[in-house]
Interface confidence: medium
């Protein structure tokens, strides 16, 4: 069986002038997947991305994520590329309000 992933891209404040963009793929099967950030249509090198492992999500399917830090204003140059079971898609960084993540002590 093949279950295609649901892909979701989010952005969050990282530091002044920078944002972290995260691409999440969920509810997919089998577990083999390519998920990577591209800049100007080219995959970023491994040392500029952070990956979560491919983990079971409890429903017999899998989930994973990849994140990278980019300069605010360059969002249009970045897309998340996903390849799974012979299908592929690209997903842009959402525009609009930046989600500010705050730590509550």
């Amino acid at each position: 069986r093949t279950v295609p992933p649901m892909v979701n891209v989010t952005r969050s404040e990282a530091s002044e002038g920078n944002i972290t963009v995260t691409c999440r793929a969920s509810s997919f099967y089998p577990r083999n997947i390519i998920l990577t950030w591209r800049q100007d249509g080219v995959s970023l090198s491994h040392d500029t991305q952070q990956w979560g492992g491919v983990l079971p999500d409890g429903n017999g399917t899998y989930q994973t994520w990849v994140a990278t830090r980019i300069c605010r204003g360059e969002e249009q140059r970045f897309t998340c590329y996903m390849e799974h079971s012979g299908n592929h898609s690209t997903h842009p960084v959402p525009s609009g309000k930046v989600l500010v993540l705050q730590s509550h002590w």
Partner: antibody, heavy 121, light 112 residues
Framework: QVQLVESGGGLVKPGGSLRLSCAAS????????MSWIRQAPGKGLEWVSY????????YYADSVKGRFTISRDNAKNSLYLQMNSLRAEDTAVYYC??????????????WGQGTLVTVSS | DIVMTQSPLSLPVTPGEPASISCRSS???????????LYWFLQKPGQSPQILIY???NLASGVPDRFSGSGSGTAFTLKISRVEAEDVGVYYC?????????FGPGTKLEIK
Amino acid sequence: QVQLVESGGGLVKPGGSLRLSCAASGFTFSNYAMSWIRQAPGKGLEWVSYISPGGDYIYYADSVKGRFTISRDNAKNSLYLQMNSLRAEDTAVYYCTTDRRHYGSYAMDYWGQGTLVTVSS
Amino acid sequence: DIVMTQSPLSLPVTPGEPASISCRSSKSLLHSNLNTYLYWFLQKPGQSPQILIYRMSNLASGVPDRFSGSGSGTAFTLKISRVEAEDVGVYYCMQHLEYPFTFGPGTKLEIK
């Protein structure tokens, strides 16, 4: 081994057009972003244009924007530069280069031998 | 646009002696991913340019280890520990951080 061979240069009058080609071999062309770089006689290097592997991202230097068009045919392993409304200041050797800045490697690691474009009346 | 400057523009060197070329950018080339997008190229007489250093301090494949790159966000240095006759040519720095990519004016290294 990797080879990039430019062609299509020559003498053209101001306002005229030329189409440069770059034939690539020795590597998987469709995986590489490409750039055109030019060098006026006796001068330094100037980046002209960039195209992503799939052709979906394209950038130009302000000096050529609206006059030059970069394109590629991955089936033919070829890169092109259509140059319209040519000016005397476009006179240069034009180099075709690979662009690998994101591969954990380096940028513009392969260059062609260049093709000379001369714009003169 | 990011402006790149180099000094000196001409550098006569005795074979076996060290050489140093400076490059400056009008804006920091340090990306938020912690890479510094500064490159060094050498164009030997009558040849196409070839890459020497990528991301400020990484030696490109096949380049002799007498070459090294260093720097910070806006100030960069290319060093040759012992100049050889084959090192003659024009050295260019280039920023690859943002469009348009821009080169320095070049430093011509010649043998005394």
